[in-house]
């Protein structure tokens, strides 16, 4: 058997660190043997047989122009082996996070804090944190460790699945490379990394009659769950054209008038999601939408709020295909006061 | 069963040296920070060291820095207390202890010790 | 590092509450949410009773509350019983040398 241990990485291959010395061990001969030592190609001895080194060649100080390839040969001139010298450094701890779209998983990524210049590699796992009270300390639940699955493999991203939301997990994130490895430990609470993804299939559409207003829908994004336990809030964001501020509401449900558009004007229009009770953070805003309030005149009498959802007789100025979901409640901005100052600027 | 087992306490010399194990069971012990907590008789608790889940980063309290070295092997799930220059004022009941631990995205911090082990009896006298 | 400073005593009658204080400084108390308590009676081990300032670990009665204010963390015993009569520390992270640090002590007496 070799008296070379091999390292994690390409068979054949031998690590140092650059600037101390490195040792190099002949992979063909048994411990001890003495063997001369060339680097390929070459043919001036590196290190002779009576080096009192047995099966090793050691380079003091390590630099670049040592990497390449060695050969070494026993007594009687037969090949002992062939070694690749490459140099680089120790793992350092990784630099890692860890994101949620949902209230039921979450991913961690990491990426190296030092190039190593090795062959590198990243294991993963998790556990639940629990802090034992005195007399419950004598039967620990089940709290791992359990792997964290790279998804898709060699990806510098790991997924938990069915996380519990009021739990929190320690993750571990350990870089391995031949030279040795480094771990960095992470706490991550579902609570504090939530942030959903973006509503989707936000539409805009003008309120006829109404040339101040502008209807906007949207849905859930897909990524939430389909029968949610945790319900969603929503900021939305609108502006004219051309103008730099955006004015921000907190719709009560899946739509919202606005009351104050500029008339004849395409609005922008996004909107934000984030968990109902606050955990996490906001979502990014979604991709905007626009919609131009309509030019028509007001129906002679302000309908009731169940005749204002009915369809109109001209279609209205639609962004996406996708149908809106109703609100989760009326909204009393509709019928407010500010419906006889927009009737007065359009009578007159 | 979750328990951490103390040993190798004992009647030592001023300026000997004595080695505390402790011998983990019952949880993933190279998941867990894990520290060592003095009691002098008739005297309140004190903080000796402390070492992370992976070994790489111990602390000390100014008391013993220099003369005590924290470690462990995780393989073996043991942590151990190496004492040096041992001094009359070492003499305590010595408490092995798990802690979670907090650990952000920049650093891990003590947190609290949950687990706490029998405790082993050093006397250093002549 | 200095130990935090606790009373040396408190004592109640059955049923009453007790408060211990903790008073450290801003590099540990006051800088950090890791104050933890301990009892311990005589003879025995030291138990976790409350961790992060406020936190109960499984198992322990919600008799016990922790609470902070700037470099002065409590303890509060509510429906004082006869076996809370023990020792209790405060402990707390140092904010250096990983280090860690606890307190002078309190010896709870039920009356």
């Known amino acids: 058997s070799s008296p070379c241990p091999q390292a994690w990485g390409p068979p054949g291959v031998q690590y140092g660190q650059p600037g101390r010395s490195v040792k190099l061990c002949c992979p063909g001969v048994t411990a001890g043997d003495p063997v001369s030592w060339f680097r390929d190609g070459e043919p001036k001895l590196l290190q002779g047989p009576d080096s009192g080194l047995g099966h090793e060649l050691v380079l003091a100080q390590a630099d670049s122009t040592d990497e390449g390839t060695y050969i070494c040969q026993t007594l009687d001139g037969a090949l002992g082996g062939t070694v690749t010298l490459q140099l680089g450094y120790p793992p350092a701890r990784p630099v890692v996070s860890c994101q949620a779209a949902d209230y039921e998983n979450f991913s961690c990524t990491w990426s190296p804090s030092q190039i190593s210049g090795l062959p590198t590699r990243y294991l993963t796992s998790y556990r639940k944190k629990t802090v034992l009270g005195a007399d419950s300390q004598r039967r620990s639940p089940s709290t791992g460790p359990w792997p964290c699955p790279q998804d898709p493999l060699g990806a510098a991203r790991c997924v938990v699945h069915g996380a519990e939301f009021w739990s929190q997990y320690r993750i571990n994130v350990t870089e391995v490379n031949p030279l040795g490895a480094s771990t960095r430990l992470l706490d991550v609470s579902l609570q504090s990394i939530l942030r959903p993804d973006p509503p989707q299939g936000l539409r805009v559409e003008s309120v006829p009659g109404y040339p101040r207003r502008l209807r906007a829908s949207w849905t859930y994004p897909a990524s939430w769950p389909c029968q949610p336990h945790f319900l969603l809030k929503f900021r939305l964001q609108y502006r004219p054209a051309q103008h730099p501020a955006w004015s921000t509401v907190e719709p009560a449900g899946l739509e919202e008038v606005i009351t104050d558009a500029v008339a004849g004007l395409p609005h922008a229009v996004r909107v934000s999601a984030r968990d109902f009770l606050d955990a996490g953070t906001w979502s990014t805003w979604s991709p905007e939408a626009w919609g131009t309030p309509s030019t028509g005149t007001i129906p002679k009498e302000i309908p009731a709020w169940g005749q204002l959802h009915t369809q109109p007789e001209v279609e209205p100025q639609v962004d996406s295909p996708a149908p809106p979901r109703p609100s989760l409640q009326p909204h009393p901005r509709l019928l407010d006061h500010r419906d006889s100052v927009e009737q007065v600027a359009v009578l007159a | 069963e979750v328990q951490l087992l103390e040993s190798g306490g004992g009647l030592v010399q001023p300026g000997g040296s004595l080695r505390l194990s402790c011998a983990a069971s019952g949880f993933t012990f190279s998941w867990y920070f894990m520290g060592w907590v003095r009691q002098a008789p008739g005297k309140g608790l004190e903080w000796v060291s402390y070492?992370?889940?992976?070994?790489?980063?111990?602390g000390y309290a100014d008391s013993v820095k220099g003369r005590f070295t924290i470690s462990r092997d995780n393989s073996k799930n043991t942590l151990y207390l190496q004492m040096h220059s041992l001094r009359a004022e070492d003499t305590a009941v010595y408490y092995c202890?798990?802690?979670?631990?907090?650990?952000?995205?920049?650093?891990?911090?003590?947190?609290?010790?949950?687990?706490w082990g029998q405790g082993t009896m050093v006397t250093v006298s002549s | 590092q200095s130990a935090l400073t606790q009373p040396p005593s408190a004592s109640g009658s059955p049923g009453q509450s007790v408060a211990i204080s903790c008073t450290g400084t801003s590099s540990d108390v006051g800088g950090y949410n890791f104050v933890s308590w301990y009892q311990q009676h005589p003879g025995k081990a030291p138990k976790l009773l409350i961790y992060e300032v406020t936190k109960r670990p499984s198992g322990v009665p919600d008799r016990f509350s922790g609470s902070k204010a700037g470099n002065t963390a409590s303890l509060t015993v509510s429906g004082l019983q006869a076996e809370d009569e023990a020792d209790y520390y405060c402990s707390s992270y140092g904010g250096s040398n990983n280090a860690g640090v606890f307190g002078t002590g309190t010896k709870v007496t039920v009356l």
């Open positions: 070492i992370y889940p992976s070994g790489g980063s111990t």
């Open positions: 202890a798990r802690d979670e631990g907090y650990c952000s995205s920049t650093s891990c911090y003590f947190d609290a010790f949950d687990i």
